[in-house]
Every structure is written in structure tokens, then in C-alpha cells.
Interface confidence: low
């Protein structure tokens, strides 16, 4: 069971990143699915290595003082959402914006029907060029 | 099937990073090989988690305006090269240069004879000290 | 065999980061253990994917000129410690400090009784908020 999906620009104002099965994507079988273009949902319980990479372009003057934060989040059936992993990068002083990349990854137990998704502080700053932003998992 | 190879400074002007089986490297068996010191080639088709870490030292004034970009690329037999993953970091203002690290990783299907390699915008900026820059894969 | 442990603030002045089995941690079975809150020790020989993520907050003026470095280290029975992976990030100019995240990961052969741990240049700069700093491994 493995998946690797590719970022997709979205007109939605939500902080949850959007993904697509496009380009050099992976979707090994129907035991993992991309739902609503926003979350990877697994049908089998077990340990998974889950990862995400987010490249963004921001400028200190044009952004809030708070850093750019990417969060890998879990929603299990009947449970609250919870943060599994987070990474933060302070905005660049480069003009018009400075690119930076964040990588998240870890081993987590998922229940049947659990979904994982990626939140960012400002989706408009995310880079969607080939290979820059992606999300995936593999079952151990 | 797994490999982990260590960066090697090169006098070549190519943007493709050079690697060696040295230090605490891994080469599990002959189903994965390091070819010409530049690419990991697999003999078996399947899903692989492929990763690379690149540490570099650059200065905004001494570099081009474009960010430092590391790309994980795929060459399948009889096919064009393609970018699997990329990460970008804006140059530092630290003098003489500021170190930064990039990590790339994802799950991809490889065909028999497929090779993966790492490209960077400026190989002269890459740090080759112990553990700073490495490249590997594992078959799921 | 898999583990994922969560960073813990420590009053110790050691450069070795402290970890805990708390929050959404993983400890698959007793073939991997967290010892003294500082190292993951494995009982079985084999290839492991080992990873660490460290988020830190630093300021160029308040820090030494040297970058913030995170190192993934190995201690095998009867052997000296050795560095497996390192990543470096130059300090931010943001006030009071600028957050940055480092991700390390690679495939390594471990002997029975081998331990892995994470060293940083300044543990007081590490961010311990939910999900920011973690450490883990999985046996291939």
C-alpha cells in the first residue's frame, strides 16, 4: 500500500492543500485513496511512513510576522483531527519572494478509514512547479 | 533492496552530483548499483522510496538571483529524463556563505534498468563534510 | 520494528536531544526501545530507515557565527560513535528568533544493540511544540 500525489493550485481559501493523481504519481491499489483532492485515506489498519514536501515562496515584508508552517494532520473515524508533524520556516527577505522547502516524515499507526492531510499557514505561497510540493505514504 | 551513498566532490562542471560507496554507505545487493558515481540503477521493477539530502553553502551577493534548487530525476530505459522531486532554498545573506540543508523523498514506481540521480543548480556550493549530503533508496 | 518518539525539553546541558513516548508516538514492539530518553536501541541486525526532524528558533545576533547543525549519530556495541547524517541551517535575522526545520533520513545497517541518537549545536533553540521535533526508525 503506497501513494504519492502531486500538489494542485486551488481557488479555495482553505488552509488544506489540494492534491491530484497527475504527473509521476503513485497509487498502488484501492486500499489507499485520494479523497476530495485533499486527503489520503487508508482502508487497512497498520503502521505507515507518511511524508509531505512543501515548497513555498514568501517575503518577510509582505507576510505576517508568524513563520510559514506546514502541518501533517490525522483524522481518525470518530476522533478529532490531530497534528502528527509540523515544520516552520521564517519568511525570506528576498524580493519579490524567496523560495524555501519543508520536508515532513514519520511513522504512525493508522486505523481503518483514517485520513491524513496537509495544512499550511498560507496556501497562496505554495509552489506548484513540477516536483516542488508532494505528499505520500507507504505501509510498513 | 536498499542503497545509501555518500557525496563526493567533483572537478566536473556537470550539475549532476557525484556519489561514492564510502564511509557508512549501504548497498544491500547487486539488484541496485551505483553507476559512474552518479546514478542509482535498479534491476527489479517495483515501488521504491527514494530520498536525497543536500547541504550547501551560498551567499546572496555571490550567487545568481535564482534560488539553489536540488532535483531528484529519473531516467527510464528508452524514455526521456524526468523530474520526480525538487526543493528550493533562497541564498543566505551570511558571510562568506550560509549553510542550508534540503531533504527530498517520495515513493515512485521504477522499471528494470531505471536510474535516479540528483541535479543541483551549483555543485560548487554543495557541502561534502561527513553526513551532510547523501542519496538513497529502498524497495517497498 | 518501528519507532517514532517525540521531543522533550530538558534541563540537561548536553547536546543530545531528549525524547519521550508521548502524544502520538509509535513503539511497535520490544525489539526497539527508547533508552534513557535519548537513544533508540535495536535488538535485531538489519537495514533500517532512520529519520529525525528538528525545528529550532534562532537569531543571528544572539547565536554564534557557526550554523545550527543537527546530527544523526550511531553507537554500535564496542565501537566509537559515528555521524550518519548531518544538516545545517544558518541562523535567521528575524527577531526575537526565526524558526527553521531540518529533516534527516537515510538507510543504514544496524547491529544488535546498536543505538542511534540526535545531537544539536544548541538544544536551547529547539522547538518542542506539538509535531515540531521528532525521531524514528523502521526496519526494512
Amino acid at each position: 500500500i503506497a501513494a504519492h500525489v502531486i500538489s494542485e493550485a486551488s481557488s479555495k481559501t482553505t488552509s488544506v492543500l489540494q492534491w491530484a493523481e497527475k504527473g509521476y504519481y503513485t497509487m498502488s491499489n484501492n486500499l489507499v485513496t485520494l479523497e476530495n483532492g485533499k486527503q489520503l485515506t487508508v482502508k487497512r489498519q497498520g503502521l505507515y511512513y507518511i511524508y509531505a514536501q512543501v515548497t513555498f515562496c514568501s517575503n518577510r515584508e509582505a507576510s505576517s510576522q508568524a513563520p510559514f508552517i506546514a502541518s501533517l494532520c490525522l483524522k481518525s473515524p470518530g476522533r478529532f483531527e490531530r497534528i502528527l508533524l509540523r515544520a516552520a520556516n521564517t519568511h525570506s527577505s528576498a524580493k519579490p519572494c524567496g523560495q524555501q522547502s519543508i520536508h515532513l516524515g514519520g511513522v504512525f499507526e493508522l486505523q481503518p478509514g483514517a485520513s491524513v492531510f496537509v495544512n499550511v499557514t498560507d496556501p497562496s505561497q505554495v509552489s506548484h512547479g513540477t516536483g516542488f510540493t508532494s505528499f505520500g505514504l507507504l505501509k510498513l | 533492496i536498499a542503497a545509501h551513498v555518500i557525496s563526493e566532490a567533483s572537478s566536473k562542471t556537470t550539475s549532476v552530483l557525484q556519489w561514492a560507496e564510502k564511509g557508512y554507505y549501504t548497498m544491500s545487493n547487486n539488484l541496485v548499483t551505483l553507476e559512474n558515481g552518479k546514478q542509482l540503477t535498479v534491476k527489479r521493477q517495483g515501488l521504491y522510496y527514494i530520498y536525497a539530502q543536500v547541504t550547501f553553502c551560498s551567499n546572496r551577493e555571490a550567487s545568481s538571483q535564482a534560488p539553489f534548487i536540488a532535483s531528484l530525476c529519473l531516467k527510464s530505459p528508452g524514455r526521456f529524463e524526468r523530474i520526480l522531486l525538487r526543493a528550493a532554498n533562497t541564498h543566505s545573506s551570511a558571510k562568506p556563505c550560509g549553510q542550508q540543508s534540503i531533504h527530498l523523498g517520495g515513493v515512485f514506481e521504477l522499471q528494470p534498468g531505471a536510474s535516479v540521480f540528483v541535479n543541483v543548480t551549483d555543485p560548487s556550493q554543495v557541502s561534502h563534510g561527513t553526513g551532510f549530503t547523501s542519496f538513497g533508496l529502498l524497495k517497498l | 520494528i518501528a519507532a517514532h518518539v517525540i521531543s522533550e525539553a530538558s534541563s540537561k546541558t548536553t547536546s543530545v536531544l531528549q525524547w519521550a513516548e508521548k502524544g502520538y508516538y509509535t513503539m511497535s514492539n520490544n525489539l526497539v526501545t527508547l533508552e534513557n530518553g535519548k537513544q533508540l536501541t535495536v535488538k535485531r541486525q538489519g537495514l533500517y530507515y532512520i529519520y529525525a526532524q528538528v525545528t529550532f528558533c534562532s537569531n543571528r545576533e544572539a547565536s554564534s557565527q557557526a550554523p545550527f547543525i543537527a546530527s544523526l549519530c550511531l553507537k554500535s556495541p564496542g565501537r566509537f560513535e559515528r555521524i550518519l547524517l548531518r544538516a545545517a541551517n544558518t541562523h535567521s535575522s528575524a527577531k526575537p528568533c526565526g524558526q527553521q526545520s531540518i529533516h534527516l533520513g537515510g538507510v543504514f545497517e544496524l547491529q544488535p544493540g546498536a543505538s542511534v541518537f540526535v545531537n544539536v549545536t544548541d538544544p536551547s533553540q529547539v522547538s518542542h511544540g506539538t509535531g515540531f521535533t521528532s525521531f524514528g526508525l523502521l526496519k526494512l
Epitope: 489498519q45 497498520g46 503502521l47 499507526e109 486505523q111 | - | 502524544g23 514492539n29
Partner: antibody, heavy 119, light 111 residues
């Protein structure tokens, strides 16, 4: 150390409501769920529901959905449970309890609040 | 909802002997890695106290004479050797899916 301090015993009339409190100390209140558990005299334990103190989200045992309302006051690190339309079936000791990490074993318990419904 | 059935409902054991309490779940509460079953001790007038988490992991500060085992649907709490202070009611509880439920309890008396 972690402590959960609950409000005192209540004697209430049928049809009335009661609001129980649970003040947490010794840990970061917003980092953990708060659970509520019911125990009728001489009986077993029943899980009522849970609240996420960070955002106030709740989940309930279906049997208590129309009976209990869970709230928190983050500024005072206090969780509340209001029980409405009380009947003799609601006479019980009510415990607030904090789960262990994310895995939901209940490692810290309040001393309990006794509620007696009687006319 | 997952139903937990404890047996026996009550148990009398001589000092120094072994007490065994069983808990059966109406469906599996174990994954490949964890069993989401926990055991509590409750003495009269006191709140429950966590003894064992995840079927077999002894909670900090709990005497080693308490042990837990099992996976899937069948779980066991053992106390050996039983001491006088172990007189109490013991409950199992699962955390597999909402709502969490408890077993009906087993009352242990020391002879």
C-alpha cells in the same frame, strides 16, 4: 503533578439541571482531551463523552447526547459538564478523567462528584 | 458499540495465590502492533486507577505482581501473589473505537 479537582456533591430535584466542574492543574490543559465517566451506585463505569479543550469539539456516547453538554474555560483550565432534565437514573458519581497521550487509557481521574436526584 | 464481558463477576482468592480475571470483547480491539485494552482497579469510595495499558504495559508505579496479556478479543489480568490491599473491583476498558466502553467489573475478595 497532574491534578483534577471536582466540584462538591449536588442534591437536585427531578427535571432540573446541574453543572459540574473539573479544574485541571499540573499540565497544559489544551494538550489533552477531557473525558467524563458515570458510575451509578453499586454499578459499573460508563463513558459519557469527551471534549477537546483546544477548540471545544465534543464526541458523545449516543446514550448521553441529549443529556450532557461539555464545555471548557481555557483561561481557568476548567472543564464543565451540564446535565439537563434530571431523573433518578442520573443519580450517580461523575468523574472527569484525562486520557493518556493520544491512546485513550485514562491515567488521571478526579475524585468524582456525587449527584443525587430526589424530590 | 463494542461490548466487553468480564468473568467471573466476583472472585475470592487466598492471600499469596493467583487471581485471574478475563475480559472478552465483542470484536477485535487489536491491531498488528497494539491491543487497545486497559485495566483499572477501583476501591470503594475512590476513583478508578489505571493498572495496565495496551493489554500488557504496566502503568508507572503499579506493583509488578499485576500483569496483563491477550490480543484480539480475549484479554486477561493476573495478580500474583495476591495481597490484602488488592481487594477491589477491576474493570477492563477498550479504546478501539468510539464510544469507549468498560466491562461490567470483577469484584476481588481476599480470603
Amino acid at each position: 503533578q497532574v491534578q483534577l479537582q471536582q466540584s462538591g456533591a449536588e442534591l437536585v430535584k427531578p427535571g432540573a439541571s446541574v453543572k459540574l466542574s473539573c479544574k485541571a492543574s499540573g499540565y497544559t490543559f489544551t494538550r489533552y482531551y477531557m473525558f467524563w465517566v458515570k458510575q451509578r451506585p453499586g454499578q459499573g463505569l460508563e463513558w459519557i463523552g469527551e471534549i477537546n479543550p483546544t477548540n471545544g469539539d465534543t464526541n458523545f456516547n449516543e446514550e448521553f447526547k441529549s443529556k450532557a453538554t461539555l464545555t471548557v474555560d481555557k483561561s481557568s483550565s476548567t472543564a464543565y459538564m451540564q446535565l439537563s432534565s434530571l431523573t433518578s437514573e442520573d443519580s450517580a458519581v461523575y468523574y472527569c478523567t484525562r486520557p493518556l497521550g493520544s491512546r485513550d487509557a485514562m491515567d488521571y481521574w478526579g475524585p468524582g462528584t456525587s449527584v443525587t436526584v430526589s424530590s | 458499540d463494542i461490548v466487553l464481558t468480564q468473568s467471573p463477576a466476583s472472585l475470592a482468592v487466598s492471600l499469596g495465590q493467583r487471581a485471574t480475571i478475563s475480559c472478552r470483547a465483542s470484536q477485535s480491539v487489536s491491531s498488528s502492533r497494539y491491543s487497545y485494552m486497559h485495566w483499572y482497579q477501583q476501591k470503594p469510595g475512590q476513583p478508578p486507577k489505571l493498572l495496565i495499558k495496551y493489554a500488557s504495559s504496566l502503568e508507572s508505579g503499579v506493583p509488578a505482581r499485576f500483569s496483563g496479556s491477550g490480543s484480539g478479543t480475549d484479554f486477561t489480568l493476573n495478580i500474583h501473589p495476591v495481597e490484602g490491599e488488592d481487594t477491589a473491583t477491576y474493570y477492563c476498558q477498550h479504546s478501539w473505537e468510539l464510544p469507549w466502553t468498560f466491562g461490567g467489573g470483577t469484584k476481588l475478595e481476599i480470603k
